[in-house]
């Protein structure tokens, strides 16, 4: 946030730039949290977009039956495994084809055993504030679809006659990792020293990291005709005077007229 | 790139004898599975006979005793000797390959194909 600067003033304003604000020769070039002529103002909003998709990943081992372990399938760049990981992917795409946040595989090690391939299963999700819950169901729908596949697709006489078999017991699930997004926790980092003050709401599922000086929020202050400002002690009302009012109290909302306390003949000091 | 080109194919009465061949090249042939599938009007593709890279074979039921499979590494050819074929044996016959050493018989797990030499069994 910058504010710039013109006339003689400049050379004093470059030295009073507040909260760690810097000048560039015309304007103090303020840091994220502050704005204003000397960045001596705290922003009552801050960005904390979440990502567009939150992504899972399952760590699994399958053992398939139908292909012997050769040499080659340890060298990634092979055109034995190359060949492998097609089918393999394409084995799982039909496996998975039911899951909206399915993404795709990758293999991470093939070894001897039949042939065990350990591997990741990619799932991805919009952000919704809901993005757990449905992340967590599509991970139990792939164990219960790997379950499924490993189970049925087996070899009966040596033989296999599915794109691929494999051994029932060799199915396992070693680790699930959730890309972690905690819109609260980034908004107290975010608020720094204010973020006793800083809190989340959400708006067409959307998370927004405010103090109570943004207007429009189920938090927000009414400083009726004054001024919102934050301060280390919180969120404080600075109230105006007009022509012919002073205002006061905690919400600005206690107004006194003038003319009651300078009399008809002092409409000014 | 992989190429595998079928030949043999023909019109034989039923009883009769016939010799289909696949000359595969870019494929090493001393490695992986290389089979013999056939599609009938209407049906879906079947495999008939497989064999590995370490000479391993295995065949499809109705076909058993009468088909044999074989390969030859030198000539990088692969080979399927039909005898006393029945009018049921009619079909679009393909060369398939894998650079795996696979014990499938589904037409899916395998990533070569040639074109297809007809088999007509008829009287």
């Known amino acids: 946030r910058t504010t710039t600067c013109f006339g003689d003033g400049c050379q004093n304003t470059a030295s009073r730039c507040k909260n760690g604000g810097t000048w560039d020769g015309l304007k103090c070039q303020c840091p994220n949290l502050y704005y204003g002529e000397l960045c001596e103002e705290v922003v009552s909003s801050i960005d904390i977009g979440p990502p567009e998709t939150i992504s899972a990943q399952m760590e699994l081992t399958v053992t398939v039956t139908s292909v012997k372990f050769t040499e080659e399938l340890k060298n990634h760049s092979s055109q034995e495994f190359q060949e492998f990981k097609q089918t393999f992917t394409e084995q799982m795409n039909i496996v998975y084809s039911g899951i909206p946040e399915y993404v795709g595989v990758n293999i991470t090690k093939l070894r001897l055993g039949s042939v065990v391939v350990e591997h990741d299963v990619l799932l991805r999700t919009k952000y919704t504030p809901e993005y757990k819950t449905v992340l967590d169901n599509a991970t139990e729908v792939v164990k219960e679809k790997i379950t499924k596949v490993t189970t049925q697709q087996i070899m009966i006489n040596d033989i296999c006659s599915d794109m691929m078999c494999f051994n029932t017991t060799g199915t396992q699930v070693q680790n699930i990792t959730v890309t972690q997004y905690d819109p609260e926790e980034d908004c107290r980092k975010m608020a720094k020293e204010y973020g006793d003050y800083f809190v989340v709401e959400y708006r067409d599922q959307k998370p927004y990291c405010i103090s109570p000086c943004e207007p429009g929020f189920s938090v927000s202050k009414n400083c009726n005709l004054g001024k919102c400002q934050m301060s280390l002690s919180g969120p404080q009302c600075l109230c105006v005077t007009t022509e012919t009012h002073w205002y006061s109290g905690e919400t600005c909302n206690q107004g006194t007229q003038k003319s009651l306390v300078y009399g008809h003949h002092h409409h000014h000091h | 790139d992989v190429q595998l080109v079928e030949s043999g194919g023909g019109l034989v009465q039923p009883g009769g004898s016939l010799r289909l061949s696949c000359a595969a090249s870019?494929?090493?042939?001393?490695?992986?599975?290389m089979a013999w599938f056939r599609q009938a009007p209407g049906k879906e593709r079947e495999g008939v006979a497989f064999?590995?890279?370490?000479?391993?074979?295995s065949y499809a039921e109705s076909v058993k005793g009468r088909f044999t499979i074989s390969r030859d590494n030198a000539l990088s050819s692969l080979y399927l000797q039909m005898n006393s074929l029945r009018a049921e044996d009619t079909a679009m016959y393909y060369c398939?390959?894998?650079?795996?050493?696979?014990?499938?018989?589904?037409?899916?797990?395998?990533?070569?194909w040639g074109q297809g030499t007809q088999v007509t069994v008829s009287s």
């Open positions: 870019g494929f090493p042939s001393s490695r992986g599975t």
């Open positions: 398939a390959a894998s650079l795996l050493y696979l014990m499938t018989v589904n037409a899916a797990a395998y990533p070569y």
């Open positions: 064999i590995n890279s370490d000479g391993r074979t």
